[in-house]
Interface confidence: low
């Protein structure tokens, strides 16, 4: 689509005569009829196939025609066409005399024609005017012409339609040749594809407008390059969505089972050595001078009651010292200078002579002990605490401080390993003497039924259009990661494509 423009500049009819040679009375009131048609080697009558236009009376006899001349006419004259400009044309310009105001062909006398020119040739689309002058015996016409494209039409023959737009169907302006030039942030043949945020992951991210980065299911982060681990994953990471790969020292389906209590909690005190002995279980090996499950208690050397026969123990920097009662001597007061005659047995103990009276032995009543029945029986002496429990004197009673995994007054009861429900995915727990055992349901295996073996939501290939399938372990369902151009829970729907365009 375009416009053939004709600019009439000057018409000379000095004698004021018609084509017949007859003079106009009082002068030739001149208007023009223009006929534009397809190229003819010899311009002949017939339809003005490219269009026609008439002017009002522009002047009398000889006159110059100004741009956009008065009297309601337009200069240049416009001959619009709605087809591909063929590059060739024929042009007929007739000058007519108007005796009255009615310029219709049927209202004019047949001899009202002043002059008629006909040209034909090639004409390329362009802004430059071609100047021409046609002279006959009595008249001269100077004019110029050109062909330009209508709005939204481009190219050598005005056949390329391009309308700038900024909507769902495209975001572009038109170049001089009619090709599209995408607005910033858009790309693709019709500039419909937004350019996502720089660095936005090609597969895991997408965008609906420029500089955006929206993550597909299972991905997160500004650039959608961080996978989302399994829901509830505590001390683990992922390399693909919904994984839970445990960090060093952690185990279990959600990596919440502590396999390295020593490192994570440093329970052993006073420089003791810690050894992991299972989930949340450890053993402290104390340095000399310390005791307790966590080696938190400072050990006095007198605590082992090294002094015999009622000797009293005194702690010293480099050990201990026994103060012996009368009749005894030796490092631990183990040697006696007494006999039964000296009544050495205290607290109602009975004395028995030995070695022909050179020695004796005391038989103590209940609750007393020692070589002279001088000691009240220590409630912990019999080491009543089972399973490595530590005995503590507390007033008239005694208490056992149990090691992890044991309970009861004397640490005689095994804590049920099943109390913590360690079997995943509905496994059944059985307490054993040295631990526990899980009986797993169909589809799971492993020490804690944490390994999925057969039920796999992705096994049936539920995702369409080459989408990637991920199994959500917590719900036994799948998630489809769609490739570009598809949506839906199974990536079954293509994103709506734009209608075709005329160019």
């Amino acid at each position: 689509s375009g416009v053939f423009q004709l600019q009439l500049q000057e018409f000379i009819n000095e004698r004021g005569v018609l084509a017949s040679g007859r003079p106009c009375e009082p002068g030739c009131r001149t208007f023009f009829r223009v006929c534009l048609k397809h190229f003819q080697a010899v311009v002949s009558p017939g339809p003005c196939t490219f269009g026609t236009v008439s002017t009002p009376v522009l002047g009398t006899n000889s006159f110059a025609v100004r741009d956009d001349s008065s009297g309601g006419g337009r200069n240049p004259l416009q001959l619009p066409f709605n087809f591909t400009w063929p590059g060739t044309f024929s042009l007929i310009i007739e000058a007519w005399h108007a005796p009255g105001d009615d310029l219709r062909p049927e209202a004019l006398p047949p001899d009202a024609l002043i002059s008629k020119i006909a040209i034909q040739g090639s004409l390329a689309v362009g802004q430059n005017w071609l100047l021409d002058e046609q002279t006959s015996t009595l008249t001269r016409l100077r004019y110029s012409y050109r062909v330009i494209c209508s709005d939204n039409y481009y190219g050598d023959n005005c056949s390329r339609l391009c309308k700038k737009r900024n909507d769902h169907f495209g975001h572009y302006v038109c170049q001089p040749d009619g090709n599209l030039s995408c607005l910033p942030g858009w790309t693709g043949e019709y500039c419909q594809q937004p350019i996502c945020l720089s660095g936005c992951h090609e597969q895991n991210g997408y965008c609906s407008k420029p500089a955006e980065c929206l993550c597909r299911p299972g991905w997160q982060g500004r650039l959608c390059n961080e996978c989302i681990p399994h829901n509830g994953c505590r001390h683990g990471t992922c390399s693909t969505p919904w994984q839970c790969t445990c960090d060093e020292g952690w185990g279990g389906l959600f990596c919440d089972q502590d396999l390295n209590y020593c490192t994570h909690h440093s329970p052993c005190k006073n420089g003791a050595t810690c050894s992991n002995s299972g989930q949340r279980s450890y053993t402290c090996t104390c340095r000399p001078g310390y005791t307790g499950v966590d080696c938190e208690l400072e050990l006095s050397e007198c605590d082992s009651n090294p002094c015999r026969n009622g000797g009293s123990c005194k702690d010293q920097e480099d050990g201990y010292h026994c103060l012996c009662p009368p009749g005894y001597y030796g490092l631990h007061c183990e040697h006696s200078t007494l006999s039964c005659a000296d009544s050495p047995c205290f607290n109602g103990g009975s004395c028995r002579e030995r070695n022909q009276g050179a020695n004796y032995a005391c038989e103590c009543p209940p609750n007393f002990t020692g070589s002279n029945c001088e000691k009240k029986v220590d409630r912990c002496t019999s080491n009543p605490c089972a399973n490595g429990g530590q005995c503590l004197n507390r007033g008239p009673s005694r208490m056992c401080r149990c090691r992890p995994g044991f309970t009861g007054t004397y640490c005689e009861l095994h804590v049920s390993d099943c109390a913590r429900n360690p079997c995943a995915h509905g496994g059944t727990c059985h307490d054993l003497e040295n631990g526990l055992m899980c009986t797993c349901p169909a589809g799971f295996s492993g020490r804690r039924c944490e390994v999925r073996t057969s039920i796999d939501a992705c096994a049936s290939s539920p995702c369409f259009n080459r989408a990637t399938c991920y199994t959500d372990l917590s719900t036994d369902t799948f998630v489809c990661n769609c490739p570009y151009g598809f949506v839906g829970s199974r990536c079954e729907f293509p994103v709506g494509l734009p209608p075709s365009f005329p160019w």
Epitope: K37, H38, F39, P47, C48, T49, F50, G51, T52, P80, F81, N82, F83, P86
Partner: antibody
Amino acid sequence: EVQLVESGGGLVQPGGSLRLSCAASGFTFTDNWISWVRQAPGKGLEWVGVINPNSGATEYADSVKGRFTISADTSKNTAYLQMNSLRAEDTAVYYCARDNFGGYFDYWGQGTLV
Amino acid sequence: DIQMTQSPSSLSASVGDRVTITCRASQDVSTAVAWYQQKPGKAPKLLIYSASFLYSGVPSRFSGSGSGTDFTLTISSLQPEDFATYYCQQSYNGPSTFGQGTKVEIK
């Protein structure tokens, strides 16, 4: 004298094919475009397609696109309409017409019934 | 595609009557409209092109007018040979489309 003469019409089963010819005379064949226009019995006129014999460029109505093909032999001053996968609704009188640059049909053939 | 709607679809008139047929385009078609006359068993004949230009050899009682979306074909004084079906056609944009036709019958 400008003349357009169609031939090749006839009876054909649905799904069948037919080729119509349009022999032109009295004007420069390569300087003009040739259109095919059809008219179903008792109905109005429907433009089918057009060819520029000089370049071979063609355009088609959506209703026939992919099934009909227009071609021209400039040595014989003849345009052709090849019709494939014919349907009952293609039943019509087919006219060829000279399509001048304004897009108007100034000369028509007598028509051929398909 | 651009739709061309003609009215009336048929009319009865007598010789000498002034007859007007209208055609409305579904969108602006400038002046790219032609009118044709068709008699039974014959090919259509061009009467008017570019909305208002009389084709050579066509009697001057036929005239056309309009631009944009509304167009009119007028027969100033109906003659016996004018009883026929008349079609409008646009060639402005996209595929060329015709009106559905107006049948002019003898009253």
